[in-house]
Interface confidence: low
């Protein structure tokens, strides 16, 4: 028959967990001995492992609630495909019985004593109630027992006396108008109301008590606006230190509108909260030095050689710059004053050349003169020799870039009768007049 197959058997509770599905045979379900099965929904859960005794169940409740009784527990032979031992089939129950005692003794009823005397009436005039009591001690109950019935009873009583009428206040009258129009001034405004001892008046015979408490009541008026307070200046504070260490600066004195602070619509302080003064350090400010532009590169030379021009011999050249404008202990210029590089000299060297493409059109010249024109050129550009682009001059200093230096003499085939530059000019069209932009604003 098909069963419900589960992926876990919970040993402690004997329950199947993790439903895998139904409609499978026990044999297929128990291909995995960790699985468990149920014959029908809610039926006994059996693990797929080889049969063995389950854990003992918890003890059943004691058969009686007081004095000695007994209680049972059981365990079951569970598993699949076998027996727990000889002659013990799957599903067999084994029982254990033990003595138990939830409570040593059983409760016993007690008995009441005789009723005690009636207590005095609960009131001294008109009608009230009186009470009498009895004790649960004839005999006393045992083992948590009790006496049947009530421990006290009550009945009505009449004092035959007329009660006095005590005074009670009538309702408060309305509040009087307020004694002022704002609060926070010298006299705090109040309102007052009164009441009469007439609801009812105290009786004469027998004499009743007068009304307790005051006949008048005062309170501060609420909802009034606060009285306005005009602001007043506090003293001038100290002059702040001169904020600069050279040249002119500005110091500030401050005062606060807090003696008193303006409140509740009162006017603020008139005048300024700050005043400034010029302070003079009489010390000129330092001026930092700034590098001027680099000078021209010197001729490309090599020590102990008269000329290296047009040779595949690397030389060196340098250029200099000056630190300008440093005054009054300003910062010196940072960086190097001299720049040195490696070079090949191609000064005045005859080199094969090629004509460049046309340059872009230049600016119109003259910009403000008559008939401005623009020009473009093609140049006879020298083809540089294929010398090594880097050299290693000193061991351990690595490779250094080498730059071509000098103005060579390029040789190109003649173009439009020219050997070095071919120029083309065009007039500029629709030229506007040059005007001072400041004059245009007027």
């Amino acid at each position: 028959d098909p069963v419900l197959c589960f992926t876990q058997y919970e040993e402690s509770s004997g329950k199947c967990k993790g439903l895998l599905g139904g409609g499978v045979s026990v044999k297929d379900c128990c291909l995995n001995t960790a699985y468990a099965y149920q014959e029908r929904n809610g039926g006994l859960c059996q693990p797929c492992r080889s049969p063995r005794w389950s854990l003992w169940s918890t003890w059943a409740p004691c058969s009686v609630t007081c004095s000695e009784g007994s209680q049972l527990r059981y365990r079951r032979c569970v598993g699949w495909n076998g027996q727990c031992s000889e002659r013990v089939a799957l599903g067999t129950l084994e029982w254990q019985l033990q003595a138990c005692e939830d409570k040593q003794c059983c409760p016993e009823m007690g008995g009441w004593s005789d009723w005690g005397p009636w207590e005095p009436c609960s009131v001294t005039c008109s009608k009230g109630m009186r009470t009498r009591r009895r004790a649960c001690d004839h005999p006393a109950p045992k083992c948590g027992g009790h006496c049947p019935g009530e421990a006290q009873e009550s009945e009505a009583c009449d004092t035959q006396q007329v009660c006095p009428t005590h005074g009670a206040w009538a309702a408060w009258g309305p509040w009087s108008p307020c004694s002022g129009s704002c609060h926070g001034g010298p006299h705090e405004p109040k309102e007052t109301r009164s009441r009469t001892c007439s609801a009812p008046e105290p009786s004469q015979k027998p004499p009743g008590k007068p009304c307790p408490g005051p006949a008048y009541e005062h309170r501060k008026c609420t909802g009034l606006p606060p009285c306005p307070v005009a602001g007043g200046w506090g003293p001038w504070g100290p002059v702040s230190p001169c904020p600069v260490t050279c040249g002119l600066g500005q110091t500030i004195e401050r005062r606060t509108c807090n003696r008193p602070v303006p409140q509740h619509g009162g006017p603020s302080c008139a005048g300024d909260a700050t005043r400034t003064h010029i302070c003079n350090t009489a010390v000129p400010c330092p001026v930092d030095g700034e590098w001027d532009l680099w000078g021209q590169w010197s001729t490309c030379v090599r020590r102990n050689m008269k000329s290296i021009s047009c040779e595949e011999i690397p030389g060196q050249q340098s250029r200099w710059r000056t630190c300008k404008g440093r005054k009054f202990d300003g910062h010196r210029c940072t960086g190097q004053q001299q720049d040195i590089r490696h070079c090949y000299s191609i000064q005045h060297c005859p080199l094969k050349g090629s004509w460049s493409e046309w340059s872009t059109w230049g600016l119109c010249m003259p910009p403000c003169g008559p008939n401005p024109t623009r020009a473009r050129q093609r140049l006879c550009t020298p083809l540089l020799p294929k010398y090594p682009p880097t050299v290693s001059m000193v061991e351990g200093q690595g490779e250094k870039n080498v730059t071509f230096w000098g103005r060579p003499l390029p040789r190109c085939e003649e173009l439009q009768g020219q050997k070095l530059v071919v120029e083309e000019k065009r007039p500029c069209l629709h030229v506007p007049a040059c005007k001072d932009p400041e004059e245009e604003k007027l």
């Epitope: 419900l4 439903l19 895998l20 599905g21 139904g22 409609g23 499978v24 297929d28 929904n41």
Partner: nanobody, 119 residues
Framework: QVQLVESGGGLVQAGGSLRLSCAAS????????MAWYRQAPGKQRELVAE???????VYADSVKGRFTISRDDAKNTVTLQMNSLKPEDTAVYYC?????????????WGQGTQVTVSG
């Protein structure tokens, strides 16, 4: 082989309802188990609800009392009715089928349908 196609996902306000449907085709006679799983961004895929061939159901604690799984063998569909939706139900919901045969089982998954619950 079994093919699964989900439908019914979408955007819904918190407290609203959606009904997801999964249509199975192919060798469906050997399916013993159908289930809905979900995967929120940055989280692992988790079981939402499953139903066996005999109709036994299991639900995740977080959806008990709000979601109901059912199957219609005539139409080869499994449905997840989702009520009282919460923002934390936002995820991609996947239909799953467990196929069981003598030689072993196989898992099949749908492409997923997005469910977004706005606060």
């Amino acid at each position: 082989q079994v093919q699964l196609v989900e439908s019914g996902g979408g955007l819904v306000q918190a407290g609203g309802s959606l009904r997801l449907s999964c249509a199975a085709s192919g060798r469906i006679s050997s399916i013993i188990h159908m289930a809905w799983y979900r995967q929120a961004p940055g989280k692992q895929r988790e079981l939402v609800a499953e139903i066996s061939r005999v109709g036994t159901t299991v639900y995740a604690d977080s959806v008990k009392g709000r979601f109901t799984i059912s199957r219609d063998d005539a139409k080869n569909t499994v449905t997840l009715q989702m009520n009282s939706l919460k923002p934390e139900d936002t995820a991609v919901y996947y239909c799953n089928a467990l196929q069981y045969e003598k030689h072993g089982g196989a898992d099949y998954w749908g492409q997923g349908t997005q469910v977004t619950v706005s606060g």
